[in-house]
């Protein structure tokens, strides 16, 4: 969590970011809050990012104002219109690209005073695994996949019942490079399973972090999965 | 879902405050940032908005009322408060509370308050 | 203040029919205007937010357009349970501020 202060003129509003992260190819959000102001007409917000030239998007007495807006952000912008007065100037970012990671500042001024605050924006991607029972093998194996990842994540499994045992030797994980040539498919293979046992493969990376678990025992089949960011910073 | 529920006399003497309560049920008033406003319709006639208040304190009022008005909020009861002195026969009127984000999406029934001696 | 203008101030229409209101503005409100319906005794109801978004629960019969000065509500089959006064309003700058009001009517 970030909170900036204004620094120039007579009064200052608080205005807080949190870090975040964007996986490419979908839809990121960044975020930025500031002390409320019911007089619409005199918000401005504006988030700038390091080392672009034009604004990343400009709101205004009620309206986005993209003529100074950078052309690698044209179409891909948009503030929460009806949530600005409650103190909400996020940023939609469509179709995240590699290239929109960096510092971004959100610059805001109300009928109140200015302030701004800096956020840290990382991009890459990240997606749930699924593990199941692969059937084909010849022994009693697991299969890890998840679909999108990058950077390359490490992958490591665990086991309920074996804590603290080291599975590298009795695993096997390839990254196969998907067709947009960035991001990878993570397959990881583990063997020697045995019965009545929950085994967890978890993927992780700088930005962030997957578990697929799979519980199997003589009647069933149990799998859950969740997924963490790891840079949910405010400041 | 969240309801709201005014309270408070339906009768007031001219000259005196009208007083009245709206108790947030089925949320808490402090979950998110609202607008948690008053709004008036006096009989056959249109809406008039009084004020709002967010629950850091802050409140912003109607100039035509400003000087007459003060809305405050009590977290711990999940209530905000409407307070109108020195009434006259003009402040008869259907009193709602709402909340409010940059529309109002949640309104109490209302509550009839006649101004009379 | 901003004044908020709404026209016609009654209509008479059958159901089945299509009904439009508008709404006028003293001074651009950008987007920010808002669609009530009220029924006699009841509190307002929210139907369109935004001047064009539709609040959930609400039919898609209802529709809002415009932005800057002037709006428009438009029901497009007037439905029996639709015969009731609506309201603009403006949250661009306080204080917020209704239209007068459009009472619809049975033919």
């Known amino acids: 969590l970030i909170i900036g202060f204004g620094i120039s003129g007579r009064h200052s509003i608080t205005v807080t970011t949190v870090a975040s992260a964007g996986n490419i190819g979908e839809d990121g959000i960044l975020s930025c809050t500031f002390e409320p102001d019911i007089k619409l007409s005199d918000i401005v917000i504006q988030w700038l990012k390091e080392g672009v030239l034009g604004l990343v998007h400009e709101f205004k007495e009620g309206k986005d104002e993209l003529s100074e807006q950078d052309e690698m952000f044209r179409g891909r912008t948009a503030v929460f219109a009806d949530q600005v007065i409650v103190g909400n100037a996020s940023l939609r970012l469509k179709n995240v690209q590699l290239t929109d990671a960096g510092t971004y500042k959100c610059y805001i001024i109300t009928s109140k005073g200015k302030g701004n605050a800096n956020l840290e924006y990382k991009t890459g991607a990240f997606s749930m695994p699924e593990v199941n029972v692969d059937y084909n093998a010849s022994s009693e194996t697991l299969r890890c996949e998840a679909p999108r990842w990058f950077p390359q994540p490490t992958v490591v499994w665990a086991s309920q019942v074996d804590q603290g045992a080291n599975f590298s030797e009795v695993s096997n994980t390839s990254f196969e490079l998907n067709s947009e040539n960035v991001t990878m498919k993570v397959v990881s293979v583990l063997y020697n399973v045995t019965i009545n046992n929950t085994y967890s493969c978890m993927i992780e990376n700088d930005i962030a972090k997957a578990t697929g678990d799979i519980k199997v025992t003589e009647s069933e089949i149990k799998r859950r999965s969740h997924l963490q960011l790891l840079n949910s910073k405010a400041s | 879902q969240l309801q709201l529920q005014e309270s408070g006399p339906g009768l007031v003497k001219p000259s005196e405050t009208l007083s009245l309560t709206c108790t947030v049920s089925?949320?808490?008033?402090?979950?998110?940032?609202?607008?948690w406003s008053w709004i008036r319709q006096p009989p056959g006639k249109g809406l008039e908005w009084i004020g709002s208040?967010?629950?850091?304190?802050?409140?912003y009022y109607n100039p035509s009322l400003k000087s007459r008005v003060t809305i405050s909020v009590d977290t711990s009861k999940n209530q905000f408060s409407l307070k109108l002195s020195s009434v006259t026969a003009a402040d008869t009127a259907v009193y709602y509370c709402?909340?409010?984000?940059?529309?109002?999406?949640?309104w109490g029934q209302g509550t009839m308050v006649i101004v009379s001696s | 203040d901003i004044q908020m203008t709404q026209s016609p101030s009654s209509l008479s229409a059958s159901v089945g029919d299509r009904v439009t209101i508008t709404c006028r503005a003293s001074?651009?409100?950008?987007?920010?205007l808002n669609w009530y319906q009220q029924k006699p005794g009841k509190a307002p109801k929210l139907l369109i937010y935004?001047?064009?978004s539709l609040q959930s629960g609400v039919p898609s019969r209802f529709s809002g357009s415009g932005s800057g000065t002037d709006f428009t509500l438009t029901i497009s089959s007037l439905q029996p349970e639709d015969f009731a006064t609506y309201y603009c309003?403006?949250?661009?700058?306080?204080?917020?501020?209704f239209g007068g009001g459009t009472k619809v009517e049975i033919k």
């Open positions: 001074q651009s409100i950008s987007s920010y």
């Open positions: 309003q403006q949250s661009y700058d306080p204080p917020w501020t």
């Open positions: 935004g001047a064009s």
């Open positions: 208040i967010l629950v850091s304190g802050s409140t």
């Open positions: 089925g949320g808490s008033i402090s979950s998110s940032v609202y607008y």
């Open positions: 709402a909340r409010a984000v940059s529309f109002l999406d949640v």
